[in-house]
């Protein structure tokens, strides 16, 4: 009768086993093993036992102890059972972000492990398991569908295999997939508002806001504004679910022209995107032009406006003849012409908006000096030791120098309150001069005396 | 049957080296394992290394490695040690031991001594 | 490398008393423990190989027990002939190590 011990044995793959192999005669003529796998003997004295060290053991395998004895061969058989836990324990690839509301395949591939029987593949989320089933198959295959939720943001899913070889005596061989973090996210299907000027005059600053809410997780929201091929760099907000991205926008000639704005919102992997045109204008203020500024009375003076080839201009409210961007009148300058000024306004149409531009120049008229009765009255007549003051008015651009002599060295006070006194009496010769001439005028002061009675 | 015989005593100076042979009976080197133990005298016993003759692999014990070689000889079914900068506490009987991971049959021993 | 200490180093004792050595080793070594006997002059032989397994062609009187760090050599009615030194040997890990022997004197 051979024996075998052990007669079942669980090992790792790539073990070595110790097997020995028993006869209950005394004498057996042969006591061996037979086995494909590398072995040793592990002398022993006597003949009715003998140990092998089988080694290298990669596979279930069943070695057979023979003997031959004088009452006939007899054999017996032990069970070696290799275990290992798998080579490959991994969540097929899946985007990191997916959108709220989404169904979501998770599927976990096992390549090997051994013996399937004690393999058990779970899926889980976070320390949730979500799906249990054994391992079938090579590579064994497990899924499971889940509806992402907002709450799932961050969680880690991932695959484990257990390789439970407790019943046999060992322990619970456990081997997890790398984690697959969702992103969970949800971007609205409105696209984001932008608000921005429709036009924008060349060498100034604008201000574009795009925003949009009802997005999760908004702190990851990205915000891309650009004019053209300017990319902006907007100074961006964040609510609860919604974010506002606020950025200057600077023009220059080389921008002149319909440019596209666009504010591109990505979340996740997805984007919505709103597209805005900007028209790009130069509209210089119109030029007022006059013969000279500076003209003397009765000079013929031209004003002239001239504007931006595409604008319509109105020269002191009154429009071109015909509408168009230049105008100009013609006129006698008089001393009333003096400080006019002459205001010319433009207009110009971009994008359907009317744009408004203006100038105004002033014209100096150099007249004068003038001296009438008006304002230099000829004849005063004042009572004695009244308190008076002596008037006289000289008009003329520039403004004339007055000066008012009795006999060529007496002063009369111009403007100033005096006490009336015979000495004030008399003929006085007023001259007001200036770059433009003199003229002189005769002002007499009467003073009359006090009556006694 | 089963025996191990061993070369003859050897006296070796210090620095010198020694090669004790050990010259198997009864059974095929190459189906298990030759195992050295040394004892130095009146002490315990002390595990050198071990060989296997199929494939020549060795395992030496940490506190000899570098100065012991073991080698086989399947032809004439002969086991080799070779302890080379001997030093005087290498004094000891050497013996070849066969089996695996306990030593059922031993040789007869041969004393190293290593004296100046 | 696992350490083997065997106690006690020494004992005497009389023909067909009941002799018990043990063996402990540094660590857990599972039942990978053999047994030695070895006489003045002699080369060890081989007694018990792991822990309890016994050898053909040595008396029945010799047992092994034990697993993990503690181990029995037990000769249950001692006779002349084993007055000798015993050693306990480790085949857990490399290097493999013995006890340092317990001598079994006459009493």
């Known amino acids: 009768q051979t024996s075998v011990s052990p007669s079942k044995v669980i090992l790792p793959r790539g073990g070595s086993v110790l097997v020995t192999c028993s006869t209950s005669c005394d004498q057996p003529k042969l006591l061996g093993i037979e086995t494909p796998l590398p072995k040793k003997e592990l002398l022993l004295p006597g003949n009715n036992r003998k140990v092998y060290e089988l080694s290298n053991v990669q596979e279930d395998s069943q070695p057979m102890c023979y003997s031959n004895c004088p009452d006939g061969q007899s054999t017996a058989k032990t069970f070696l059972t290799v275990y290992w836990t798998p080579e490959r324990v991994e969540l097929a690839p899946l985007p990191s972000w997916q959108p709220v509301g989404k169904n979501l395949t998770l599927r976990c591939q096992v390549e090997g492990g051994a013996p399937r029987a004690n393999l058990t593949v779970v899926l889980l989320r976070g320390e949730k398991e979500l799906k249990r089933e054994p391992a079938v198959g090579e590579p064994a295959e497990v899924t499971t569908t889940v509806l992402v939720r907002r709450d799932h943001h961050g969680a880690n899913f991932s695959c484990r295999t257990e390789l439970d070889l407790r019943p046999q005596g060992l322990e619970l061989f456990e081997n997890t997939s790398a984690p697959y973090q969702l992103q969970t996210f949800v971007l609205p299907a409105t696209p984001p508002q932008l608000v921005s000027p429709r036009v924008l005059e060349v060498d100034t600053q604008g201000t574009v806001v795009c925003s949009l809410d009802g997005l999760f997780p908004v702190s990851e929201a990205q915000v891309h504004l650009a004019l053209g091929d300017q990319r902006l760099n907007p100074t961006v907000t964040y609510g609860n679910d919604s974010f506002s991205a606020k950025a200057s926008v600077s023009v220059t000639a080389e921008d002149e022209g319909t440019q596209r704005l666009t504010c591109a919102v990505i979340l996740g992997n997805q984007s919505q995107e709103t597209l805005q045109t900007v028209t790009i204008y130069s509209f210089p203020a119109p030029n007022v032009i006059l013969t000279k500024p500076e003209v003397s009375e009765g000079t013929e003076v031209t004003v002239k406006c001239e504007a931006h080839p595409r604008a319509k201009v109105t020269l002191n409210g009154v429009p071109a003849q015909p509408l168009g961007p230049r105008a100009q009148l013609l006129l006698k300058a008089t001393p009333e012409d003096n400080g006019r000024s002459f205001s010319c306004s433009a207009t110009l149409e971009v994008a359907g908006q009317l744009i408004h531009k203006n100038q105004t120049r002033e014209l100096r008229v150099l007249y004068g000096p003038r001296l009438d009765e008006r304002d230099c009255p000829g004849n005063w007549t004042w009572p004695e030791n009244s308190q008076q003051t002596p008037m006289c008015q000289a008009w003329g651009n520039p403004l004339p120098e007055l000066k008012c002599l009795k006999d060529g060295t007496f002063p009369l006070p111009i403007g100033e309150s005096v006490t009336v006194t015979r000495d004030l009496e008399g003929t006085y010769l007023c001259r007001a001069r200036s770059t433009q001439g003199e003229v002189t005028r005769k002002v007499t002061v009467n003073v009359l005396s006090p009556r006694y009675e | 049957q089963v025996q191990l015989v061993q070369s003859g005593a050897e006296v070796k100076k210090p620095g010198a080296s020694v090669k004790v042979s050990c010259k198997a009976s009864?059974?095929?080197?190459?189906?298990?394992?030759i195992h050295w133990v040394r004892q130095a005298p009146g002490q315990g016993l002390e595990w050198v290394g071990r060989?296997?003759?199929?494939?020549?692999?060795?395992i030496y014990d940490p506190k000899v490695q570098g100065r012991v070689t073991m080698t086989a000889d399947t032809s004439t079914n002969t086991a080799y040690m070779e302890l080379s900068s001997l030093r005087s506490e290498d004094t000891a009987v050497y013996y070849c031991?066969?089996?695996?991971?306990?030593?059922?049959?031993w040789g007869q021993g041969t004393l190293v001594t290593v004296s100046s | 490398d696992i350490q083997m200490t065997q106690s006690p180093s020494s004992l005497s004792a009389s023909v067909g008393d009941r002799v018990t050595i043990t063996c402990r080793a540094s660590?857990?070594?599972?039942?990978?423990l053999h047994w030695y006997q070895q006489k003045p002059g002699k080369a060890p032989k081989l007694l018990i190989y792991?822990?309890?397994q016994s050898i053909s062609g040595v008396p029945s009187r010799f047992s092994g027990s034990g697993s993990g760090t503690d181990f029995t050599l037990t000769i249950s009615s001692l006779q002349p002939e084993d007055f000798a030194t015993y050693y306990c040997?480790?085949?857990?890990?490399?290097?493999?190590?013995f006890g340092q022997g317990t001598k079994v004197e006459i009493k």
């Open positions: 660590q857990s070594i599972s039942n990978n």
């Open positions: 060989i296997d003759p199929a494939n020549d692999n060795t």
């Open positions: 031991a066969a089996s695996g991971y306990w030593f059922a049959y």
């Open positions: 792991h822990a309890s």
């Open positions: 040997q480790q085949s857990n890990s490399w290097p493999y190590t």
């Open positions: 009864g059974f095929n080197i190459k189906d298990t394992y």
